[in-house]
Every structure is written in C-alpha cells, then in structure tokens.
C-alpha cells in the first residue's frame, strides 16, 4: 500500500525521497524510475545520480532541492494523465542488501475549471517536506513521517491546516504519524 | 554485440579462495546490474550473487560471509571472490547480465567457467 | 524463500507436438500487477538462454512456438510445435524476491 501523491494537470508534480548522507559530500547513488520497484534495479530510469552529481535525467524529471544534503525528491514538469502511476524512488546505499526502495503513487486529477479556496491548498504544496517515506519493498507498508527540524508551531499549522485538507482522510487511512524531534 | 567471457576457475583446495573474473563488452556496463549464477555438475542452476548498477551488493545465506562481488566500470569488469570454498561450491560459474532496468533476470550469459574444489 | 517446483521432471515429446511445463511457486510472485517469473532454455554444454520474461512476454529473438502464461504461483511454458532444436532443459525462476531462485528443470527429450 504505496503512499498516494497528487497533482493537477500542467502543474508541477512532487514526489519525496530523503535520505542522510554519512557526511557531507558522501553521496550515495540514487535512481528514480517509473513503474514499481524491481528486485535490483529502478524500472524506467527518468533521473539518476552518482556519488557526485546527476548524471542522468530525462526531460520534465529533475531534483529540485538540495540532494547534496539528501533531498532526491522528484519534480515532475507540467504533468498530464499520462504521467499518472507507481513510481521508483532507490537509494543504493552500498554494502549487502542495504538499498532503500520507496514505491510512490501520483495521482494526476484534469484541472479544475475555478481555482480552489485558499485553504483548500493542497498539502504537499503547502508542507513538501512533510511527506516522506519509510524503506519498504514489495509487500510492505510505507508510513508517512516527519524531518526532524520540525518545532511545534510549525506542527501546530499543521494541524490547522489538515483540518480542512482534502488529504485528512487520506493520511489517516495511511497510517500517517507526525514525529517531534 | 553483447558479450561476457568468464576467467578464474580451476582447482582448489577446501579452505581455499579463488576471485572469478567477468569481462564485459558491447553494452554500457555501468547502467546494468551483474550477477553470478553457478551450475554444479549434473545439476541446476543457483544464483550465487548479485551487484546493481549503484553498487548495491546481494547474496544467498548459502554463499553469504564467503563470497563477494565487485565491479569495475572503468574496466566494464565484474568479480567474485570467494573465500572459504566448500567441496559443495565446485561449479560452472556463469556471469550474467541482469535485464536493464530490473536486474533480477538474465538476458546475457557468459560461457561458464568452471570451479573445483577438492583435496 | 521462494521454491519453485517444476514438473514434470522429464517431458517425452516427439517432434511436432505440443510440450507443456509447468513451474509452481511457494508463493505468490505477483508485484504491482506483473507476474516476476521468467523461463530459460539450456542445452548440454551451453549456458541458459532466457525465453519469456514477466510470465508471458517473448524475448527478442525466441520462435513463436514458445509462449508463456500464468499468474500468482501457477505457470505454464507452452512450445506448440517441438523441433528438433527444442530439446533441452527448460528452468522458472523468480526475481520477485532474494534470493533469486530456479526451478530444478524439465528436461524435454525425444519421444
């Protein structure tokens, strides 16, 4: 049971994958694939990166915060239907069987005709950094958690605005907790 | 055209070690998982190890503590070393190259080199 | 693990008729609606060639006589019309999970 992330059509679409390098500048390879995560691999390779740099992307597809610091969350450009599927987030963390395999859900919805209340915002707009998932593979769970520069205030907004987020219920039924610390 | 030749085999003494050697050409080495697959004599096929394209390292319990796996994308190389060997390791060693994009599957196959282990 | 028990062991076949083999896995080998299972052929002295990939898909190259099919833990390789050139052994094996695991082969052999 993926986490399920969603965006409107032409707008850019965000899929988080962290991780905390050993120290800075000591990157690990990740790869962002579409389609499930394989045994081994990562599916349909959009974007890949080396112990240094992104050495592989495909158009649309491009890391928008600092993945020196282990922030290899994905950006999708001005998304459409087809864009829509189980994507492939694997940081191959080296050593025996040490890789971590996050399967994500995008949900593509058609634009709507009258923009939507202000806070009726979308939550992964107005917390990216809230979502992020917990290693899994296949027949695993995935839980939603917290980074840990979080403070209370911030949490306290939090919960103000998922009283009336359209994703209250999604987060609930998805096991989703929120850490302090 | 895609090939893998095999180096390395021979015999060896139970306790032994011995590194196996698989050199690739005709594909992009670096994107492609390798792995290692072994056929003892008479018998069918084992999967023995495994290295994806980021370096990430798998093994069967039955192998686990005594072989390893490594690879040289400068050199388009792939290795087992294996350490420890058992009379039950003698072998024809395969190199396989694991499908793009997955690497839990074999769409490349070397010619096998074979291992014996005995006294 | 995964065990993956194919049967029969030995498949007596003349030339021209179909061959039917069959792999069961211990479990399910379904993920994210593809069905992880692949088929090999090996023939004496020759390393394994890979025939059909995620249960039914014909790899590049293969005679249209060999197809696959199945889903869960029950699988079937089908060559339709045996040749001469089709007597081998014939291996499952799942990358659903590690270890990755085979089958203990069906050996095909003439009638």
């Known amino acids: 049971s993926e986490v399920e992330y969603r965006a409107e059509v032409g707008q850019n679409a965000y899929l988080p994958c962290f991780y905390t390098p050993a120290a800075p500048g000591n990157l690990v390879p990740v790869c962002w694939g579409k389609g499930a995560c394989p045994v081994f691999e990562c599916g349909n390779v959009v974007l890949r990166t080396d112990e240094r740099d992104v050495n592989y992307w495909t158009s649309r597809y491009w890391l928008n915060g600092d993945f020196r610091k282990g922030d290899v969350s994905l950006t999708i450009e001005n998304v459409t239907l087809a864009d829509s599927g189980i994507y492939c987030c694997r940081i191959q963390i080296p050593g025996i069987m040490n890789d971590e395999k996050f399967n994500l859900k995008l949900v593509i919805k058609p634009a709507k005709v009258t923009p939507a209340p202000t806070r009726q915002r979308d939550f992964t707009a107005a917390f990216p950094r809230m979502l992020t998932t917990r290693g899994h593979g296949p027949a695993e769970t995935q839980t939603l958690g917290s980074l840990p520069d979080i403070n209370l205030t911030q949490i306290s907004t939090l919960a103000n605005e998922l009283r009336d987020s359209r994703l209250a219920n999604d987060l609930r039924d998805s096991g989703a907790t929120i850490r302090i610390g | 055209e895609v090939q893998l030749v095999e180096s390395g085999g021979g015999l060896v003494q139970p306790g032994g070690s011995l590194r196996l050697s698989c050199a690739a050409s005709g594909f992009t080495f670096s994107r492609y998982a390798m792995s290692w697959v072994r056929q003892a004599p008479g018998k069918g096929l084992e999967w023995v190890a495994a290295?994806?394209?980021?370096?990430?390292?798998y093994f069967p319990d039955s192998v686990k503590g005594r072989f390893t796996i490594s690879r040289d994308n400068a050199k388009n190389s792939c290795y087992l070393q294996m350490n420890s060997l058992r009379a039950e390791d003698t072998a024809v060693y395969y190199c396989?190259?694991?499908?793009?994009?997955?690497?839990?599957?074999?769409?490349?196959w070397g010619q096998g080199t074979l291992v014996t282990v005995s006294s | 693990d995964i065990v993956l028990t194919q049967s029969p062991a030995t498949l007596s076949v003349s030339p021209g008729e179909r061959a039917t083999l069959s792999c069961r896995a211990s479990?399910?080998?379904?993920?994210?609606?593809?069905?992880?299972m692949q088929w090999y052929q090996q023939k004496p002295g020759q390393a394994p060639r890979l025939l059909i990939y995620?249960?039914?898909n014909v790899e590049s190259g293969v005679p249209a006589r060999f197809s696959g099919s199945g889903s869960g833990t029950d699988f079937t390789l089908t060559i339709s019309s045996l040749q001469s050139e089709d007597f081998a052994v014939y291996y499952c094996q799942q990358s659903m999970k590690v270890p990755l695991t085979f089958g203990g082969g069906t050996k095909v052999e003439i009638k």
């Open positions: 290295i994806s394209s980021g370096g990430s390292l």
């Open positions: 396989a190259r694991g499908r793009e994009a997955d690497g839990g599957y074999f769409d490349y």
């Open positions: 995620a249960a039914s």
């Open positions: 479990e399910s080998v379904e993920y994210y609606g593809t069905s992880l």
